[in-house]
Amino acid sequence: IIDGYKCKEGSHPWQVALLKGNQLHCGGVLVDKYWVLTAAHCKMGQYQVQLGSDKIGDQSAQKIKATKSFRHPGYSTKTHVNDIMLVRLDEPVKMSSKVEAVQLPEHCEPPGTSCTVSGWGTTTSPDVTFPSDLMCSDVKLISSRECKKVYKDLLGKTMLCAGIPDSKTNTCNGDSGGPLVCNDTLQGLVSWGTYPCGQPNDPGVYTQVCKYKRWVMETMKTHR
């Protein structure tokens, strides 16, 4: 997260880290005791999933292996459309005050809605600085029409934009797959942005979760 702040401890109990060994690979969101939602471009053969801590690499955090993941069948590496994936945990999460599932959206929030994005991604770009603490940024949803003025053909129909005018605050490498939460519901998953990160007036781009609720529910049901 560029130009963000340290999240209030315990305020994001659904936030998970997908680790490759001990290294951060992506963010993710707990949606069920067996399931984590993340970005399709975060796909690996297997994952170590850290839950229940704001500190990356916290020894006291829950760590669960995951060997199965289900990318959206329409995901494109070229256009990043349908950048959404479900990761099935090998064993169920122990729910607590520190580990909770996020609320999936009942509706799509409108432009102008205030939201918070979080992650352990680099806080500087192009030179990288990875924080140990979970970082947050407060952003507002931007209409597709406004966002298309910036990204034109790069912006797909199920992509959601968020940012703050003239501000550098944005997501960056390592934040991918993490949550954009608006009014206590999951509205976005970090998908992409421009590189180097933090270009003013280049919104962050997210997978619009409200458009995928049926796919999420059906995939979890099929592979339970």
Epitope: K152, D153, L154
Partner: antibody, heavy 122, light 107 residues
Amino acid sequence: QVQLQESGPGLVKPSQTLSLTCTVSGGSISSGGYYWHWIRQHPGKGLEWIGYIYRSGYTYYNPSLKSRVTISVDTSKNQFSLKLSSVTAADTAVYYCARAKQLTTSRYFDYWGQGTLVTVSS
Amino acid sequence: DIQMTQSPSSLSASVGDRVTITCQASQDIANYLNWYQQKPGKAPKLLIYDASNLETGVPSRFSGSGSGTDFTFTISSLQPEDIATYYCQQASDLPFTFGGGTKVEIK
């Protein structure tokens, strides 16, 4: 279809400034996510990245050339330019302009100009 | 700067042969690795992006693999039109850097 076309003098005298312009057609230089680069290739050798400019005017130069390079953009003409000062014979090369899709998830040069040979000689 | 070491610098193979080129990065670049083909007197052309993704319109005999520091580019069945120099390029960190190139010739 995006096209890039380099233009400028093919011969520059030592100690002078090399100036090249790249004209972009079929796409807007103001589009977010696309950066505009200069790359050169010495005769019979490999590719050397010089630097880029973004729609906002944000630039980044190769540290090895930074003190001599300036890249600028003219969005109204859909052009970007390279200036390389205090040239020597070692700057003789084919100069390419290129577009890069440059996202957090994916970055690559997808369109290139055909290249222009610049010879530094008195 | 990240150094990209490409090998071999040149190779000669027969039509129909499988050709493999390797590229090693001096540090972890994840999958930010691209492959380009350059024919004499022409600009480089993108073949593979993000280590393993085939650019639109590029024949399927070209492929790429790898992650981290070690990458491979393969032509499954060499064709006469594949005579060119091939370059790897890292896009993980600035400045972007290229490998030294591999000149592919027909025996």
